[in-house]
């Protein structure tokens, strides 16, 4: 048995910051599981996880650099990455582990969501002032 | 799904007994299987689970010391071993299937229970 | 350990009546919990999984209710094959601890 996962097919980063929502077909609450995002079509980067155990607090934390945190619904978890480079734009997917009780389950891989960073348009100030009129 | 319990048993006080729970009719080792007690007169009682993927077990802390959960993947089968048998473990056991419905537990196959007598 | 309180111990009612059966657990357990039925001499036999949902075959005049600490059985309708006992069981964690149970008797 798989659980299966949906994501926007599409979200726009415009102030360098996102929620991506990853809905599953599974009650994450009574369960011990890890949750992650990963980017680019092969999955490579581990962007953010999540750990929860139904007795305790959730860890949230990245090992490559990105700012993230994540919150928990019943059926779905949200990261919330902030911080992003126009050069992140990129497709990223959700993954689920369930870790306990028995027996371990995870994901079909679902179809990812492209976040398209868009910079923050500040007016370009001139690096060297006209020439001043007399 | 199946679950096929030994018969009844007679002991002695102070003695064991090992009660077996043969699981037929889907994958052995991908279900944990728990174990109830249902006393005369009284409310069912959770001992614990066993899941035969990993050999994982739970125990009800009250169980500890008195039942001990294996199994033998080869027939199937999980068992439940009780020591130190006193009138107090007179009762019904039953072993039951626990089934995942996306998240929520609960255990819709049960096998028909075997009844332990403790008497001198 | 979780702590469930079902209530009422017994009831005796007659045919054609509707009879609530209620479970309080001393935390919340967001809906992990489950309604059996049993028969004297039998197996119990599940109702209700996830606090509301209707095991396939089970008649519809069982139903679910409840969140958080407090949860209900509801039987409406009653038939003479519904006279037996009946248990709510949490599965928050270990021990998966069952009520009580409450006897359902014929009036």
């Known amino acids: 048995n798989k659980i299966l996962v949906k994501q926007s097919p599409m979200l726009v980063a415009y102030d360098n910051a996102v929620n991506l929502s990853c809905k599953y077909s599974y009650n994450l609450f009574s369960r011990e599981f890890r949750a992650s995002l990963h980017k680019g079509l092969d999955s490579a980067v581990e962007v953010c996880v999540v750990y929860g155990n139904y007795s305790q607090q959730l860890q949230v934390y990245s090992k490559t650099g990105f700012n993230c945190d994540g919150k928990l619904g019943n059926e779905s978890v949200t990261f919330y990455l902030q911080n992003l480079y126009v050069n992140q734009t990129d497709i990223y997917f959700c993954k689920i582990e369930v870790m306990y009780p028995p027996p371990y389950l995870d994901n079909e891989k679902s179809n990812g969501t492209i976040i398209h960073v868009k910079g923050k348009h500040l007016c370009p100030s001139p690096l060297f002032p006209g020439p001043s009129k007399p | 799904v199946k679950l096929q319990q030994s018969g009844a048993e007679l002991v002695k006080p102070g003695a064991s007994v090992r009660l077996s729970c043969k699981a037929s009719?889907?994958?052995?080792?991908?279900?944990?299987i728990h174990w109830i007690k249902l006393r005369s007169g009284q409310g069912l009682e959770w001992i614990g689970w066993?899941?035969?993927?990993?050999?994982?077990?739970q125990y009800n802390a009250k169980f500890k010391g008195k039942a001990t959960l294996t199994a033998d993947k080869s027939s199937s089968t999980v068992y439940m071993e009780l020591t130190g048998l006193t009138s107090e473990d007179s009762a019904v056991y039953f072993c039951a299937r626990r089934d995942d419905f996306s998240g929520y537990d609960a255990l819709p196959y049960w096998g028909q229970g075997t009844m332990v007598t403790v008497s001198s | 350990d979780i702590q469930m309180t079902q209530s009422p111990a017994s009831l005796s009612v007659s045919v054609g009546e509707t009879v609530t059966i209620t479970c309080r657990t001393n935390?919340?357990?967001?809906?992990?919990l489950a309604w059996y039925q049993q028969k004297q001499g039998k197996s119990p036999q599940l109702l209700i999984y996830?606090?509301?949902h209707l095991v396939e075959g089970v008649p519809s005049r069982f139903s679910g209710s409840g969140s958080g600490t407090q949860y209900s059985l509801k039987i409406t309708s009653l038939q003479s094959e519904d006279f037996g006992n009946y248990y709510c069981q949490h599965f928050w964690g270990t021990p998966c601890t069952f009520g009580g149970g409450t006897k359902l008797e014929i009036k």
């Open positions: 935390e919340n357990i967001y809906s992990n």
């Open positions: 996830a606090a509301t």
């Open positions: 009719g889907y994958t052995f080792t991908e279900y944990i």
């Open positions: 066993f899941y035969p993927g990993s050999n994982d077990i």
